[in-house]
Amino acid sequence: ASVGLPSVSLDLPRLSIQKDILTIKANTTLQITCRGQRDLDWLWPNNQSGSEQRVEVTECSDGLFCKTLTIPKVIGNDTGAYKCFYRETDLASVIYVYVQDYRSPFIASVSDQHGVVYITENKNKTVVIPCLGSISNLNVSLCARYPEKRFVPDGNRISWDSKKGFTIPSYMISYAGMVFCEAKINDESYQSIMYIVVVVGYRIYDVVLSPSHGIELSVGEKLVLNCTARTELNVGIDFNWEYPSSKHQHKKLVNRDLKTQSGSEMKKFLSTLTIDGITRSDQGLYTCAASSGLMTKKNSTFVRVHEKPFVAFGSGMESLVEATVGERVRIPAKYLGYPPPEIKWYKNGIPLESNHTIKAGHVLTIMEVSERDTGNYTVILTNPISKEKQSHVVSLVVYVPPQIGEKSLISPVDSYQYGTTQTLTCTVYAIPPPHHIHWYWQLEEECANEPSHAVSVTNPYPCEEWRSVEDFQGGNKIEVNKNQFALIEGKNKTVSTLVIQAANVSALYKCEAVNKVGRGERVISFHVTRGPEITLQPDMQPTEQESVSLWCTADRSTFENLTWYKLGPQPLPIHVGELPTPVCKNLDTLWKLNATMFSNSTNDILIMELKNASLQDQGDYVCLAQDRKTKKRHCVVRQLTVLERVAPTITGNLENQTTSIGESIEVSCTASGNPPPQIMWFKDNETLVEDSGIVLKDGNRNLTIRRVRKEDEGLYTCQACSVLGCAKVEAFFIIEGAQEKTNLEHHHHHH
């Protein structure tokens, strides 16, 4: 056979035996002559270098460029390719010689006691066990152990080739420790050398450092870094570390394989770097590399080394947090420190504990912020080693979108007597206070009879064309008073009033309040009637268990048949046209009430009395009168609110305080309840009486002690009482300093 490229000037070397394959018996002599057109060389099996003693290469006697290769007494191991080639070219002629040695049918490689076969556990990969034959047509099988298994050529993926060896899918022998080829000749078995099976993997899935980040230590502490490499099976791993002071004398490295669950397709290796007594020069990047030979992966982490334990607040720590009612508030404690500090939160000096509404940790989280969450929050960081403390105050301001206090009525509504002057009020509570309250109006019939709009609980008046009250053409003459500020139920509220000079036209009025976080609105139905008039005796909202009378007064010459009704619970009207006062047209929803009739010179007065008013008595009361001439019914509606009885409560705590002699003390005690409670003060459980030094103001809400003396020290109690009970708060006042002896000073005394 010829190998190489044909050349114009050179013919291939010519062999004396013109065959591709030559088969000879052992112990005979092999002699091949090669002739060519320039210097020739021979290559033969098992020794490519030409130093074999048994092989003789001689120049031919009969010509130039001719060499004869001779091997006397050939053996099975001489089987193989014999190549004659021109020096420094690829031009060659090759003959494959089988030396049939039935006592040694396999060619042994030079000086090999055993061979090594490298395989990967891959279903698609085949491996060749190089048990070459000295006979071309041997019946060869492969034996693997342990356990013992025999593989026979199947004409497909398992085969034996005398020039190549035994080919088999690698996964079939990956379990084995060793394999060898076996040939049967005349019932005799012959074995090749043993081949050790080495299963190789190489893939590294990942390299993970633990701790992975944020490693901080102080000088003298021990650093322990674990580096874990996860690999496929049958992988060996080299680890290496790179770090700031790699020549560290206190360094310790331990590498080991980790046990993985059986059946796992993964192997784990661990390298642990330990540095005892870390120093500042050890600060920096630590990198662990894991390598299988074909794949390297690495991972890094930064180690920060502090001179000593410390704690401090980070620059991003807020001092003011603003939120709107209902929002989730997060106030993170931003700190620098080693080791991480213990974190404690306080509100107005009281420790905060986590519950379902608040989480006090690295981040103070208030799930749904409310007004009462407003205040100063102190976060105290404590270094667990040095016990050094740092504190920071965060002010939380909770904003409230405008809320309009008066109950928003849907239907029906109070009626107003024709021609009277009326005042409409919107009491707005908002934080910050509203930057404006605007009033708008619209004629009742424009709004009520718009069939294209559906009515909902949230929007009972489907009015869109609201007009500013400055433009009162076609409506009632209006004047908007300057906003007033009032303390109502302990809250600062803004009161906006709209004065209707003369009630001539039925209309709807809307007040709209806006602040930085939202808006609120209230729609007031202003229904003007020329019919009867309702008044309340006494003229204030009753509290439960009080008595109240509703008076319906009508001109006797105009009206007759005065009757009191109470409006029963009713669903919202379906039709827009029924708004806003459908009462007179639909008497089915009215319950007739018992009442007493009185008369004076001009009027009939129908009085409906409620003794011991209860919350069930709240609602809309209708007085119906009939026009004597036209028989047309006129009805007037009045909403009655019954206030709930509420036991006294005191808002805000009295706080213990220390004052120096001669200074003044001023404290407040705000109480609420219905009926309104009476406030009394006690010192050391004895009633406190006003005198020149003790001043009680605002219904005893505010207590001032002027020019305090040592005798003023003691336990002060504020007590708020009503028929429903009492509430009290206490505080201890400490008076410091020496009493000055002077006759000029006016001393107050206590009773």
Partner: antibody
């Protein structure tokens, strides 16, 4: 700047031996796997051998197994390829390459080996 | 061993135009970790190879975004948009899914 400089190539007779060296600089040599890749004239690139960072694990192409030995000296930042029983088909430009995640991200300029009698 | 076939062998281009080089593997290069282990190299004339793309589509650092890699388990494409004079050389693909790692036969990109 990462640099890999190969040396030791030359002309050698079939059956002869040679050792190639690759001097590394500009990176921490001991943290990277290293490989030899060769390119015979007009042929495709062929991976030859690879070695792990500590030198414990080596891999070879079937064509050079048993004849070539890859090794490294991390103290000297040098990679080696000891080549024995050289054949004509080993003639090629030999590149050393740095490996990370299995990728050869930096290569040397190569050294030429010619095997011829 | 996995055989990598590259086409075309030669690719004459005009600067500014876009070209694609194909690479086909005798076996899927999608490994069980979900990654496709195919790399692209450029060997400029007289220089050593330079890594362009790894894991089929990730550009190596410093490689312009004109180079992009795509493909499936066995068929892969290197696209060069707006070819520049400095892009000439031989482009090789390489598989890393199975040892021994093998290279494609190369595609020579030359300016017309």
């Amino acid at each position: 700047e990462v640099q890999l400089v190969e040396s030791g190539g030359g002309l050698v007779k079939p059956g002869g031996s040679l050792r190639l060296s690759c001097a590394a600089s500009g990176f921490t040599f001991s943290m990277y796997g290293m490989s030899w890749v060769r390119q015979a004239p007009g042929k495709r690139l062929e991976w030859v051998a690879s070695i792990s960072i500590g030198g414990s694990y080596t891999y070879y192409a079937d064509s050079v197994k048993g004849r070539f030995t890859i090794s490294r000296d991390n103290a000297k930042n040098t990679l080696y390829l000891q080549m024995n029983s050289l054949r004509a088909e080993d003639t090629a430009v030999y590149y050393c390459a740095r490996e990370m995640d299995g990728n050869y991200d930096y290569w040397g300029h190569g050294t030429t080996l010619t095997v011829s009698s | 061993d996995i055989v990598i076939t590259q086409t075309p062998l030669s690719l004459p281009v005009t600067p500014g135009e876009s070209v694609s080089i194909s690479c086909r593997s005798s076996k899927s290069l999608l490994y069980k970790d979900g990654k496709t282990y195919l790399n692209w190299f450029l060997q400029r004339p007289g220089q050593s190879p330079q890594l362009l793309i790894y894991l089929m589509s990730t550009r190596a650092s410093g490689v312009p975004d004109r180079f992009s890699g795509s493909g499936s388990g066995t068929d892969f494409t290197l696209k060069i948009s707006r070819v520049e004079a400095e892009d000439v050389g031989v482009y090789y693909c390489q598989q890393l899914v199975e040892y021994p790692f093998t290279f494609g036969s190369g595609t020579k990109l030359e300016i017309k």
